[in-house]
């Protein structure tokens, strides 16, 4: 029997009955037995075919099979109802190897002329199954020459067998509070040949709670406890299951935090799976109720480990634990059933007692030492010497705990001193100079230091006067001695201050005339005003129309009077504004150099002379009369003059200070 | 982290005025709480001088008032203690506090001595 | 000012002892007490606050209890690292005060 050819030689050929074609002879048997590579199969068909027709084939016929199957046995030359000719069909191996018989009988009634056929060798497509048979792969399969592989769907892995993809499905942890979770694929089926587990993990305190939900289908079996596929569940308390079947399992309180499900998947079988719904509970805090006058957010039904409430006060309360104030309150449960910080009071807002108003008063509005919530208060100021800056001095305690104006200032008011107000009422009239009287010019201020000088008081803390007066001293300003509230130079009844800095206009050159000649002094401490101290006033922009020339100014000071010596007591004298040419061709001829009246000065004095401001007077303010205002202001500062004051046609030179309010209030509101 | 730091003169003349800052980091001093000054004379227990609120509000002790300013730079996140007037009895370790108490500065020591 | 008493103003023990301090306030300050350990030439360390609330990262060892005016700071077992002095504190009235302090000392 001739074997055929056999792999690795190439695998292909024809066959043929004996004596092809002429007819065959009785009696034959012949045998072909053809093998091809592992993972292709043999692929024939007939090219010819005349065999003798008999019932079922039993007299001459050829044979084909493939291992123990017969694949076809076949006679005549067209096929009948029980009996196959091949025709046009091609015959395929079930695996790599194909037997061909061939057989005739003893007699032939005519001549036969028998068959040829061909064969081939060809690869075996083992993706491609018939339906109702089970898939070569479980997902994807790969047909390739001589063979196939199997691969996966993501979050699957290939089973040691190449054909099964088992889940991945371990390693899941849950840590939320409640959650759900499922076989693979579910709804679908689940997969075979799978191992999962589940691990649900919260915190210490928290119990976990399982409901099956939904459908519930895992491959049983009717005598034994779930042999084939199954679910257990497992906490550190005891073990639930196995589970399988189709009848939801009961809800599972499992009084533990930690769960472990495991599922296992033999490789038969097609169910749905199962569902689970967890959630978890906890030890209950007890019930936060609110504090009077504030309120709890958010509201549950009960609170539970890591539940949370704030406390929210009404407008003008506010949260304190004890005295302390606390902007925002949080409880937090705790796993024994307690809140992690006990509950704050709101209580109403308290601004405390006001601040004490420097030359000032407060008033209780809403009642005797009421403080409160809406409570208000009245600040006022000391009259005739002080008036309140800016505010109407009403406070009102807001919810923020302040003290707060009309116009939202948390700040205190200002009581700020009085300018300008002196004893004295001007004449009209020149006349010699006088001695001062108490309260006429409250804000001369006496500057010893060196030398005898004088300024001016603006307002509670600054002295003005000339830079020339106070240049020595401008790097030890502690030097200097500043008296005020005194007639007499040389009482020892007056009011001491001292300075803390010195200010010289920067455009002042000592000893190169007498331009910018201005200078501030700033004290330690606020002085009080009274009648005998208070501050001049600084010059309106309208100032100017009351120190045109002939417009009198009064001078004040204990400089040199004519007989020659300081003044023991205040001294004044009231002149008349010069005209500014007429004061500046004075000083043009020797010895006086060009130039130096400025238009930073302006000049007063008799043309007589006779009157005048003298050494020792330096600093100190020409006063004007504001009529609108009925307020005195500085409108200049003794600065220099002749060698011999009062000198005719020679006049007092002064600095205009009206030329230096933007140096002063940028100086003043700096430091 | 919450982390407060006292800094300052560790001697101050008799008279004059003790200034001390405490510098928080980890916490804003605008968020919440109370920011205390306590300060503790050698060997002896503790004394609460006062404190600044979150919103900037003060409170003293009454025996300390007329003395006392606490102030703060939200800017730089410190606040400040100003004692005028000095002795040699405020002589102490001061102590910049976070109330509830939970965290505290470790203290300078300053000493009133001519 | 509200006064806090505390007692004794020192003790002797040893290690494993159950301590007990007292703090009496001269009038009521609710449950707002903390307490304080405090060891030499070191700040003030917070134990407990509205009187039973431990301080996080504070042992179990330590508790408190009371309200009004009586207020007690307890060590179940006394530790090496235990021995100070120990302050209570009321911040329920202006002004906040201090108790004398407890000085727990080895046996």
């Known amino acids: 029997t001739p074997l055929g050819p056999k792999w690795p030689e190439p695998v292909f050929g024809r066959l043929a009955s004996p004596g092809f074609p002429g007819e065959y002879a009785n009696d034959q048997e012949r045998r072909w037995t053809l093998t091809a590579p592992p993972g292709y199969r043999l692929r024939l068909y007939f090219t010819h075919f005349d065999l003798e027709l008999s019932h079922l084939c039993e007299y001459d016929f050829v044979k084909l099979s493939s291992g123990a199957k017969v694949l076809a046995t076949l006679c005549g030359q067209e096929s009948t109802d029980t009996e196959r000719a091949p025709g046009k069909d091609t015959f395929y191996s079930l695996g790599s190897s194909l037997d061909i018989t061939f057989r005739s009988d003893y007699s032939n009634e005519k001549p036969f002329t028998g068959f040829e056929a061909f064969y081939a060798a060809e690869d075996i497509d083992e993706c491609q199954v018939a339906p109702g048979e089970a898939p070569t792969c479980d997902h994807h399969c790969h047909n390739h020459l001589g063979g196939f592989y199997c691969s996966c769907r993501a979050g699957y892995v290939l089973h040691r067998n190449k054909r099964t993809c088992s889940a991945l499905c371990s390693g899941q942890v849950f840590t939320q509070r409640s959650g759900e979770l499922s076989s693979p694929e579910y709804p679908r089926p689940y997969p075979k040949l799978s191992s999962c587990t589940y691990s649900i993990s919260l915190e210490e305190g928290f119990s976990v709670i399982l409901d099956f939900v939904e459908s519930f289908d895992v491959e049983t079996h009717p005598e034994t406890l779930c042999p084939y596929d199954f679910l257990k569940i497992q906490t550190d308390r005891e073990e639930h299951g196995p589970f399988c079947g189709k009848t939801l399992p009961h809800r599972i309180e499992t009084k533990s935090n930690t769960v472990t499900i495991t599922f296992v998947t033999d490789e038969s079988g097609d169910h749905t799976g199962w569902k689970i719904h967890y959630t978890s509970t906890a030890q209950p805090c007890p019930y936060p109720m609110a504090p009077p006058n504030g309120h709890v957010s958010p509201v549950q039904a009960k609170y539970i480990l890591k539940d949370s409430f704030s406390i929210f006060c009404e407008t003008g309360y506010e949260l304190l634990q004890g005295h302390l104030p606390l902007k925002s309150f949080t409880a937090v449960c705790q796993k024994d059933g307690s809140w992690d910080r006990p509950m704050p009071a709101c209580s109403i807002v308290d601004c405390g007692p006001p601040d004490d108003l420097p030359s000032g008063r407060v008033e209780y509005i809403t009642g005797p030492g009421v403080t409160t919530y809406k409570a208000v208060i009245q600040y006022s100021c000391e009259e005739t010497f002080y008036t309140m800056k800016v505010n109407d001095g009403k406070y009102v305690c807001e919810a923020d705990g302040f003290w707060t104006s009309s116009k939202g200032e948390k700040s205190l008011p200002v009581c700020e001193p009085v300018c300008g107000l002196s004893a004295r009422t001007t004449g009209g009239r020149i006349y010699g100079g006088q001695k001062a009287k108490p309260g006429d010019f409250p804000w001369q201020v006496l500057i010893l230091g060196g030398t005898t000088a004088a300024g001016a008081l603006l307002y509670d803390n600054w002295v003005l006067t000339a830079a020339h007066a106070v240049y020595e001293q401008k790097h030890d300003a502690s030097a200097l001695d500043i008296r005020m509230g005194t007639l007499k130079r040389l009482s020892p009844h007056y009011t001491q201050a001292w300075s803390e800095a010195v200010f010289i206009h920067e455009g002042y050159t000592h000893d190169a005339g007498f331009d910018n000649d201005i200078a501030l002094i700033k004290l330690n401490n606020k002085v009080v005003i009274n009648s005998n101290i208070t501050p001049i006033c600084l010059p309106r922009k309208e100032a100017e129309s009351f120190m045109r020339t002939d417009d009198i100014g009064t001078a004040s000071g204990w400089g040199l009077t004519q007989r020659g010596f300081l003044a023991r007591n205040l001294m004044y004298v009231d002149i008349p504004i010069v005209d500014h040419q007429k004061c500046t061709a004075a000083y043009e001829k020797p010895p006086y150099p060009r130039g130096s009246v400025t238009a930073n000065m302006l000049c007063a004095g008799l043309e007589s002379g006779g009157k005048d401001s003298c050494r020792g007077d330096s600093g100190g303010a020409l006063v004007f009369l504001d009529s609108e205002t009925e307020r005195w202001f500085v409108g200049g500062i003794v600065s220099w003059g002749s060698m011999n004051c009062g000198e005719a046609g020679q006049y007092g030179v002064y600095t205009k200070v009206i030329n230096y309010i933007p140096w002063i209030e940028n100086i003043i509101s700096d430091f | 982290q919450v982390q407060l730091q006292e800094s300052g003169p560790g001697l101050v003349k008799p008279s004059q005025t003790l200034s001390l800052t405490c510098t928080v980091s980890?916490?804003?001093?605008?968020?919440?709480?109370?920011w205390n000054w306590i300060r503790q004379p050698p060997g002896k227990g503790l004394e609460w001088i006062g404190y600044?609120?979150?919103?900037?509000?003060?409170s003293y002790n009454p025996s300390l008032k007329s003395r006392v300013t606490i102030s703060r730079d939200t800017s730089k996140n410190q606040f400040s203690l100003k004692l005028s007037s000095v002795t040699a009895a405020d002589t102490a370790v001061y102590y910049c506090?976070?109330?509830?108490?939970?965290?505290w500065g470790q203290g300078t020591l300053v000493t009133v001595s001519s | 000012d509200i006064q806090m008493t505390q007692s004794p103003s020192s003790l002797s023990a040893s290690v494993g002892d159950r301590v007990t301090i007292t703090c009496k306030a001269s009038?009521?300050?609710?449950?707002?007490v903390a307490w304080f350990q405090q060891k030499p030439g070191k700040a003030p360390k917070p134990l407990i606050y509205?009187?039973?609330y431990r301080y996080s990262g504070v042992p179990s060892r330590f508790s408190g209890s009371g309200s009004g005016t009586d207020f007690t700071l307890t060590i179940s077992s006394l530790q090496p690292e235990d021995f100070a002095t120990y302050f209570c504190h009321q911040y329920n009235t202006y002004p906040l005060t201090f108790g004398g302090g407890t000085k727990v000392e080895i046996k």
């Open positions: 009038q009521n300050v609710g449950s707002n």
């Open positions: 980890g916490y804003s001093i605008t968020s919440d709480y109370a």
């Open positions: 600044i609120s979150y919103s900037g509000r003060t």
């Open positions: 509205s009187a039973s």
């Open positions: 506090a976070r109330y509830w108490g939970d965290y």
